[in-house]
């Protein structure tokens, strides 16, 4: 922490300007009034402060606003945002997308994924839901940031907004997030024709249940292996060899290349070797002919 000293009369600060770059840390601490700093935050980013000096300015604002900064200050943080921790940001209430854009621009190229995730969370909370304008802002200024939101926050996305989400925006989404987004996407695209529907639903299929994957296998979609590999393991395991062959179409030969990777490996172990042999790919590891499969989990459930 910066030690407290009194401000020399000749160093008194009446406005935030370039002269402050010559102030030592303790002089900034003693001479800059926090309320003045907050009122003139829009000037700070144009001044080439050192990181040490920015630490002092942050300390000033923290003292003035122990419960969290107001949006009028947040909007003009500029490079001071790089000094914020997720804990600081959690105290904020942000509703303006202009504020979000400004801070996303500042964070670009810096290792700030945790801070950005917290900021986006605060924006969604502040605005009440993940509306189209927010999604559009995220896709434009922070591709992939949509996936930084928790499944709980994503549940506030109305299906009508799903159309604005691009495949690259879902690239970093985990299974739990896709579990939330998939039903919304299914609803949003339900009136589309088969091929158009598949193109649209493809990025969301990591959240699809087995019955939906089985349904797709009847629609000649020729799913590529990249999409197949992103399906939930639980959705893939019940598929028959015939269903997978129909689902993948000409891409079925890719199973050979991916046979060591889950979920392909796990699916192979569940199939009869005779059935796998019908694919002519040399896939190995299926259940040998003549073996009986007992599902012990069923017996446990009954006892």
């Amino acid at each position: 922490d910066v030690e407290r000293t009194t401000c020399p009369p000749e160093k008194e600060v009446h406005e935030i300007d370039e002269s402050l770059i010559f102030y030592k840390k303790r002089e900034l601490e003693a001479c800059v009034d926090a309320a003045l700093l907050a009122a003139q935050m829009d000037r700070v980013d144009a001044i080439p402060f050192t990181y040490e000096q920015l630490d002092v300015l942050k300390h000033k604002l923290d003292e003035l606003y122990p419960q969290g900064y107001p949006e009028s200050v947040i909007r003009h943080l500029g490079h001071l945002f790089l000094k914020m921790s997720p804990e600081d940001i959690r105290k904020w209430n942000v509703t303006s997308l202009e504020t979000l854009k400004a801070l996303l621009k500042v964070s670009k190229g810096h290792e700030m994924s945790a801070q950005v995730a917290t900021l986006i969370d605060r924006v969604v909370v502040g605005r009440g839901q993940l509306d189209k304008d927010t999604v559009d802002t995220l896709t434009a200024f922070c591709p992939g940031c949509l996936c930084s939101l928790s499944p709980e926050r994503l549940s506030s996305v109305p299906p009508s907004v799903i159309g604005a989400v691009r495949p690259q925006d879902l690239d970093t989404c985990g299974p739990r997030q896709l579990d939330v987004l998939y039903p919304k996407a299914r609803l949003a695209f339900q009136n589309m024709s088969g091929s158009e529907y598949f193109v649209k639903i493809r990025p969301f299929l990591g959240g699809a249940p087995t019955e939906d994957v089985k349904a797709l296998s009847q629609q000649n979609v020729s799913m590529d292996l990249a999409t197949f590999m992103k399906l939930r393991r639980e959705a893939v395991l019940p598929l028959t060899v015939a269903e997978v062959q129909k689902l993948l179409g000409p891409h079925v030969e890719g199973l050979k290349v991916e046979e060591q990777h889950s979920p392909v490996r796990d699916w192979i172990l569940k199939q009869r070797q005779d059935d796998l042999d019908t694919l002519g790919l040399g896939l190995q590891g299926g259940i040998p002919n003549g073996y009986l499969i007992l599902d012990l989990s069923v017996r446990e459930a009954l006892s």
Epitope: M229, K256, V257, E259, L281
Partner: antibody, heavy 119, light 108 residues
């Protein structure tokens, strides 16, 4: 433009570890596996293993099992290859190469990272 | 593992001549799972041909590939000065993936 940019050259002592990074840009990161291939001075190419950035699943060439670890950071579109217990014969150029999932050919390669193991 | 043996190790030819490079596998390779790469000194390998005979993007038509089972061939119909390099075959029909030892095409 599709690009794979690898980290810089490394000089390591025997027994140490090295971690090489490969940053991808210009394509959907999770639609392609990232494979690692190495080439000892004046020698041919040797496949080390791959990682599926979508699931984090890995397959390693048994020759390197227990010594190689491949990881990914989806948010940074970056994969890493760490090789431990280095010996002089690990001196090589290490390449990352992308491979569309479901195919086995490498259509884009990184520029290579030279790793020198010397006491 | 499948061992790929390339022959000859070195091929000395003049520009304009036809080059025929061989790749022999120790056991059968599914033809969809064989590719060829070109590598010049100090550069990364470059994909030339995939699935035995498909030309990669931007590769001139003087390059062609053929073969099945255990024997595969890369042909350069008329050598250009920029074609002098090392060529590798590669299989992903069987785990672990393997490369051939390479054929160096040098100027005679």
């Amino acid at each position: 433009e599709v690009q794979l940019v690898q980290s810089g050259a490394e000089v390591k002592k025997p027994g140490a570890s090295v971690k090489v990074s490969c940053k991808a840009s210009g394509y959907t990161f999770t639609d392609y596996n990232m494979d690692w291939v190495r080439q000892a001075p004046g020698q041919g190419l040797e496949w080390m293993g791959d990682i599926n950035p979508s699931t984090g699943g890995t397959i390693y060439n048994q020759k390197f099992s227990g010594r190689v670890t491949m990881t990914e950071d989806k948010s940074a579109s970056t994969v890493y290859m760490e090789l431990s217990s280095l010996r002089s014969e690990d001196t090589a150029v290490y390449y990352c190469a992308r491979r569309r999932i479901g195919t086995g050919y490498f259509d884009v390669w990184g520029q290579g990272t030279t790793v020198t193991v010397s006491s | 593992e499948i061992v790929l043996t390339q022959s000859p190790a070195t091929l000395s030819l003049s520009p304009g001549e036809r080059a025929t490079l061989s790749c022999s596998a120790s056991s059968s390779v599914i033809s969809s799972y064989l590719s060829w790469y070109q590598q010049k000194p100090g550069q990364s390998p470059r994909l030339l041909i995939y699935r035995t005979s498909n030309l990669a993007s931007g590769i001139p038509a003087r390059f062609s590939g053929s073969g099945s089972g255990t024997d595969y061939t890369l042909t350069i119909s008329s050598l250009e000065p920029e074609d002098f390099a090392v060529y590798y075959c590669h299989q992903w029909s069987s785990f672990p993936y393997t490369f051939g030892g390479g054929t160096k095409v040098e100027i005679k």
